[in-house]
């Protein structure tokens, strides 16, 4: 194929691939008609002047995962047709000025996973057609003003996984076409007001895993097209009341792993496209009325692992589409009987790992479609008569690890549980805590007359049997976080997000048999 170097493979489609540790320099002669050239996993340490001079038709050039640490300014001369250039995963510390001069057709430039210490305005001043610039995974500590001023057509800019401590409010001002901006995993402590004002077409903004403590009230007010906003794993302690007010297109918002102490009413919205909101691992202590009232399409709300001790009766007003509510691992002692009244479509609720001492008899009164209720590891001694009677779809109920008081008052609950045993699961059953003579015995099979011989047990109407199915629970298992290493380690550069590091397999979703769409 017009002379293919022995250390390369050349296809009929003008594609050349050169790989292997034995390669220490750009192979020659390269086929003059090559349109795609990949040089991967070699021991090439430098690119000298014009090694690609005779392949001027080249459209894509990937020089990745090599030992490349030095490039001569004229290395890419005569590649005027080049649209895609990747130098990712090398050992570049410095980019020579003028390196990309003459690459008038260049649309994608990947410089990620190198050791770049700085970039300058002159580096990209010739790249007026650039649409994508990947700089993540380098050692950049600051971005000088003007660095991107000539990249007016840029749609995707990734600066994640660097060492940026601050951002100038002017650095992105000319990027009116930018759709994706990623700044995750840096050391940013604050974002100056106006930083994103010029980004009127921005659709995704990734700021997760920084050290941001405060958000300016109008930080996102010009970003009306923003669809995905990642703010998780920062140090945000409060949200200015209007910070999310101008984001009507938002369909993903992550705020978990911050230091939020409170949420003001109406803080979210209007966000008619937001279907999931993850707020776990914050310091939220209470939920006021109407705090989520603008989120009328929300389907999943995760509030687990906070310090919530009080939920106002109208806190969940407006959440008419909510399907899953996770409140586990908080500090709840009591719940108002009306707190879930508006959640007519709720299917899964996790309340485990709280301090609930009792539940109002009407707590689930309007939530007729509930399929899974997690109440394990609370301070419950009994439950009100008929609390689950109307829940014909209930197929999973977790009640273990509560200090059940097995006196005569427990009989109605015991009888109902006896008739609905499959819903309790097979892993752990609820056991008596008191009186002492029955401690540790199964609540389901305990003989209440033996437990309290001195008390006359009156005829008490038992909980009616509700339908269950031989194969229940017939809904999918929810194991929130696998403990496998690939899930608990941080996500690599190009996935652009980070998994949380936890090993407790119920720690986030907190539902073990809950149904899922």
């Amino acid at each position: 194929y017009h002379g293919c170097p022995s250390e390369c493979t050349c296809s009929r489609a003008s594609q050349v691939e050169c790989t292997g540790a034995r390669i220490v320099a750009v192979p020659t002669p390269l086929p003059w008609n090559a349109m795609s050239l990949q040089i991967l996993n070699t021991h090439i340490t430098e690119l000298n002047e014009s090694p690609f001079l005779n392949i001027s038709a080249l459209i894509a050039l990937r020089i990745e995962k090599n030992e490349l640490s030095r490039i001569t300014p004229g290395a890419f001369r005569n590649l005027g047709s080049l649209r895609y250039l990747s130098l990712a995963n090398n050992k570049l510390q410095v980019l020579p000025i003028g390196l990309f001069q003459g690459l008038d057709s260049l649309e994608s430039l990947l410089l990620s996973s190198n050791q770049l210490l700085q970039i300058q305005p002159a580096h990209f001043s010739q790249c007026s057609n650039l649409k994508e610039l990947q700089l993540h995974g380098n050692h950049l500590e600051y971005i000088p003003d003007g660095a991107f001023d000539h990249l007016v057509g840029l749609t995707k800019l990734n600066l994640g996984k660097n060492s940026l401590t601050h951002i100038s409010p002017r650095v992105f001002q000319h990027l009116g076409n930018l759709q994706v901006l990623r700044l995750y995993e840096n050391r940013l402590t604050d974002i100056p007001m106006g930083t994103f004002d010029g980004l009127v077409n921005l659709q995704e903004l990734a700021l997760q895993q920084n050290q941001i403590g405060l958000l300016s009230p109008g930080l996102f007010h010009n970003n009306h097209n923003l669809q995905r906003l990642y703010l998780s794993n920062n140090h945000i302690s409060q949200l200015p009341p209007s910070v999310f007010m101008q984001l009507p297109q938002l369909n993903r918002l992550t705020l978990f792993g911050n230091s939020l102490k409170e949420l003001s009413p109406g803080i979210f919205g209007p966000m008619p496209n937001l279907r999931e909101l993850w707020l776990y691992d914050n310091h939220i202590s209470s939920l006021p009325d109407n705090v989520f009232s603008n989120l009328r399409q929300l389907q999943v709300l995760i509030l687990s692992r906070n310090q919530i001790s009080f939920i106002s009766p109208g806190a969940f007003n407006g959440l008419t589409e909510l399907r899953e509510l996770s409140l586990h691992t908080n500090a709840l002692q009591d719940l108002d009987g009306n707190v879930f009244r508006m959640l007519a479509n709720l299917q899964n609720i996790s309340l485990q790992n709280n301090r609930l001492r009792q539940l109002p008899g009407n707590i689930f009164a309007n939530v007729n479609g509930l399929m899974a209720i997690q109440l394990q590891n609370n301070q419950l001694e009994n439950l009100p008569l008929g609390i689950f009677d109307h829940l014909g779809k209930l197929c999973e109920l977790r009640l273990y690890d509560n200090p059940w008081r097995c006196d005569s008052d427990i009989l109605p609950l015991r009888n109902w549980l006896l008739l609905n045993q499959p819903r309790l699961g097979t892993d752990t059953v609820p056991v008596c805590f008191s009186p002492a003579n029955v401690r540790g015995q199964s609540l389901i099979i305990i003989n209440v007359n033996v437990a309290v011989p001195s008390v006359h047990v009156p005829e008490v109407p038992s909980y009616p049997e509700t339908p269950w199915y031989p194969d229940t629970p017939s809904y999918p298992d929810t194991t929130s976080v696998s403990s496998t290493t690939e899930l608990t380690s941080p996500v690599e550069d190009y996935t652009d997000l980070t998994t949380i590091q936890v090993t407790d397999d119920r720690s986030v979703w907190g539902m073990t048999q809950a149904q899922s769409g």
Epitope: E321, E324, Q347, S480, V481, V508, W509
Partner: antibody
Framework: EVQLVQSGAEVKKPGSSVKVSCKAS????????IHWVKQAPGQGLEWIGL????????NYNQKFKGKATLTVDTSTTTAYMEMSSLRSEDTAVYYC????????????WGQGTTVTVSS | DIVLTQSPDSLAVSLGERATINCRAS??????????MAWYQQKPGQPPKLLIK???SLESGVPDRFSGSGSGTDFTLTISSLQAEDVAVYYC????????FGGGTKVEIK
């Protein structure tokens, strides 16, 4: 361009296991749910379960609990489905698919992996 | 599980004519705002392709001759003017509870 590329066809003996991979590209892998769907020869579609790479969370159809295990490797943006104790009725095409939110429809699908169980 | 029953099993329609496929759920899959119903098209040897989500929302890139309607338990996929490339099997799917699919409707040209 959003792509889900699945591993090649497999022929397995009854009682053995198979692990099908689904390599994602063109989107932020951890930001979407990955579903798995079974289609037996000449049959309709059957939902196996989902995995959410963001936290590693899984949901299973009770029918496939104990049969299928869903995992992800976020470093390679790849989802896996392992099927154990294979029987002839596990012969099918298995698809991975992407969903934006947990209850959303599946907007992109892999090309499918044919698993044949035969002695 | 929610059972989805599609009708008819197969359908032969002339080019340019209207094709209508029905899907009935064994219980409601709708709220006041949304119906958790989707429609897919599958051609031989290919994976399913999403056409309609949330009962009536046309997926990006899908020709507007496809439309979806219905709520509660009864849903319809309509192809307003059948084209040769529309020959396929069509499936409905609900995500209200554990996801289930209809048995499929084969659309052919008369």
């Amino acid at each position: 361009e959003v792509q889900l590329v699945q591993s090649g066809a497999e022929v397995k003996k009854p009682g053995s296991s198979v692990k099908v991979s689904c390599k994602a590209s063109g989107f932020t892998f951890t930001d979407y749910y990955i579903h798995w769907v079974k289609q037996a020869p000449g049959q309709g579609l059957e939902w196996i379960g989902l995995v959410y790479p963001y936290i590693g969370g899984t949901n299973y159809n009770q029918k496939f609990k104990g049969k299928a295990t869903l995992t992800v490797d976020t470093s390679t943006t790849t989802a896996y489905m392992e099927m154990s104790s294979l029987r002839s009725e596990d012969t099918a095409v298995y698809y991975c698919a992407r969903g934006d939110n947990k209850y959303d429809a599946m907007d992109y699908w892999g090309q499918g992996t044919t698993v044949t169980v035969s002695s | 599980d929610i059972v989805l029953t599609q009708s008819p099993d197969s359908l032969a329609v002339s080019l340019g004519e209207r094709a209508t496929i029905n899907c009935r759920a064994s219980q409601s899959v709708s709220t006041s705002s949304y119906s958790y119903m989707a429609w897919y098209q599958q051609k031989p040897g290919q994976p399913p392709k999403l056409l309609i989500k949330y009962a009536s929302s046309l997926e990006s890139g899908v020709p507007d001759r496809f439309s979806g309607s219905g709520s509660g338990t009864d849903f319809t996929l309509t192809i307003s003017s059948l084209q040769a490339e529309d020959v396929a099997v069509y499936y409905c799917e609900q995500s209200w509870e554990i996801r289930t699919f209809g048995g499929g409707t084969k659309v052919e040209i008369k």
